[in-house]
Amino acid sequence: GELETSDVVTVVLGQDAKLPCFYRGDSGEQVGQVAWARADAGEGAQELALLHSKYGLHVSPAYEGRVEQPPPPRNPLDGSVLLRNAVQADEGEYECRVSTFPAGSFQARLRLRVLVPPLPSLNPGPALEEGQGLTLAASCTAEGSPAPSVTWDTEVKGTTSSRSFKHSRSAAVTSEFHLVPSRSMNGQPLTCVVSHPGLLQDQRITHILHVSFLAEASVRGLEDQNLWHVGREGAMLKCLSEGQPPPSYNWTRLDGPLPSGVRVDGDTLGFPPLTTEHSGIYVCHVSNEFSSRDSQVTVDVLDPQEDSGKQVDLVSAS
């Protein structure tokens, strides 16, 4: 006869590990007992359990409550045991010694490998601002046994760098994703993907990129200068910009206070029926936490009774 076992038994942390030991005997042979022991080199044999045909399953005190027989069916020549709730310290070499009648004793070894699935964490880098050079967008760390694989899934252009730290029974892997921030990256997902043999499927953590920027400001509404004449109703100027965070707008008049009746509504400056008093230089001030921009325009309200042309100058400053 001979013993059938596995060279390596792999189990995920917290699961039950079946340690196989089956005696493939000839007809009429019987198993009298099966002894299981921890057999790591240098530590000496440490008994786990003894299965005896007459005296049952005896579990050593160190493994009390953790060693069971597998659920049925159970072949009389099967000396397999279950090691319940596997922990990292269980990883190592095990030996089963089988006493048979009449063939005598046999022994076999196996290695128990306990997979420790990682619990990844993603840490965003410093605030991203347009105009910066290569900047850390996020780092992702995962620790497990064996070492997990950490990669990135994104459509954003960038570079990655990884480093690992080995511990006694596990390894931590950190991967960093660097990029040159641009406004087009705003709202784009950056996903850390962690692969490990102890995971049924890859673990994914997604970070949404936020890049601070502020576009140049411009003013719309003066395109047709002939519309800016005395008596016209509904005239308005609109300040155009965009940014992250969304900017706020403020209107002022460079050559004095805003005329009576002129309304400010966010990015829009609304005029009452136009008079020559509305002529002047208007400034749109755009700002967010990242930056500020100004755009100024000159409004010249045409009085038809005065035979003078309307002139408009647009100036942008930042």
């Epitope: 198993v31 299965l51 005896h52 045909s53 005296y55 049952g56 399953l57 005896h58 579990v59 009390e64 409550g65 953790r66 060693v67 069971e68 027989q69 659920p71 049925p72 069916p73 159970r74 072949n75 009389p76 020549l77 099967d78 000396g79 319940r84």
Partner: antibody, heavy 119, light 107 residues
Framework: EVQLVESGGGLVKPGGSLRLSCAAS????????MNWVRQAPGKGLEWVSS????????YYADSVRGRFTISRDNAKNSLYLQMNSLRAEDTAVYYC????????????WGQGTLVTVSS | DIQLTQSPSFLSASVGDRVTITCRAS??????LAWYQQKPGKAPKLLIY???TLQSGVPSRFSGSGSGTEFTLTISSLQPEDFATYYC?????????FGQGTKVEIK
């Protein structure tokens, strides 16, 4: 001498509870999977419940799941069956039985204890 | 659940007769079957496990055979103390189940 002795049976009203005990002698109870089997008057054998040697695994027949609980106290070399919400159809002789280590067949049986559920 | 059907349910025989009882399983249980003997007012007694292995102390006139779904218990020469009820039990998987029993009576 290797033996199992059940106790705790008796007359109980429907909806009531009983706790059966099984004391082992002549062997270490914690070395074996243990079982409860019942036999209604004039009927055949019905497996009720099993518990593994370390107490980590428990199994129940559909007819008792949720009402009966199997447990063991290895320090006292005893097996228990807590029976709640008893019904007339639970009336039977209840046996505890030892599961053989290499094949699970019930190699040692107690003498049985009678449970009667009646109003 | 695995169902076990024994036949016959009743059997009349004389001392010295060869008696065969059959147990059929509703699905393949390999060799994971046990046979028990029960006398009135007594607990069952294990006769045979894993289909064909005789339990220690059981007379050799008892034998078992079969695998898969069909099993037999044979008493080669019936003795007076063998008049009893016999049960098969599958120990392939939980829930463990018993056959309905075969009562062997004196003819």
């Amino acid at each position: 001498e290797v033996q199992l002795v059940e106790s705790g049976g008796g007359l109980v009203k429907p909806g009531g509870s009983l706790r059966l005990s099984c004391a082992a002698s002549g062997f270490n109870l914690n070395h074996y999977n243990m079982n409860w089997v019942r036999q209604a008057p004039g009927k055949g054998l019905e497996w009720v419940s099993s518990v593994s040697s370390g107490g980590g695994f428990r199994y129940y027949a559909d007819s008792v799941r949720g009402r009966f609980t199997i447990s063991r106290d290895n320090a006292k070399n005893s097996l228990y069956l807590q029976m709640n919400s008893l019904r007339a159809e639970d009336t039977a002789v209840y046996y505890c039985a030892r599961g053989a280590v290499f094949h699970d067949a019930f190699d040692i049986w107690g003498q049985g204890t009678l449970v009667t559920v009646s109003s | 659940d695995i169902q076990l059907t024994q036949s016959p349910s009743f059997l009349s025989a004389s001392v010295g007769d060869r008696v065969t009882i059959t147990c059929r399983a509703s699905q393949d249980i390999s060799s994971y079957l046990a046979w028990y003997q029960q006398k009135p007012g007594k607990a069952p007694k294990l006769l045979i496990y894993v289909a064909s292995t005789l339990q220690s102390g059981v007379p050799s006139r008892f034998s078992g055979s079969g695998s898969g779904t069909e099993f037999t218990l044979t008493i080669s020469s019936l003795q007076p103390e063998d008049f009893a009820t016999y049960y098969c039990q599958q120990i392939n998987s939980y829930p463990f189940t018993f056959g309905q029993g075969t009562k062997v009576e004196i003819k």
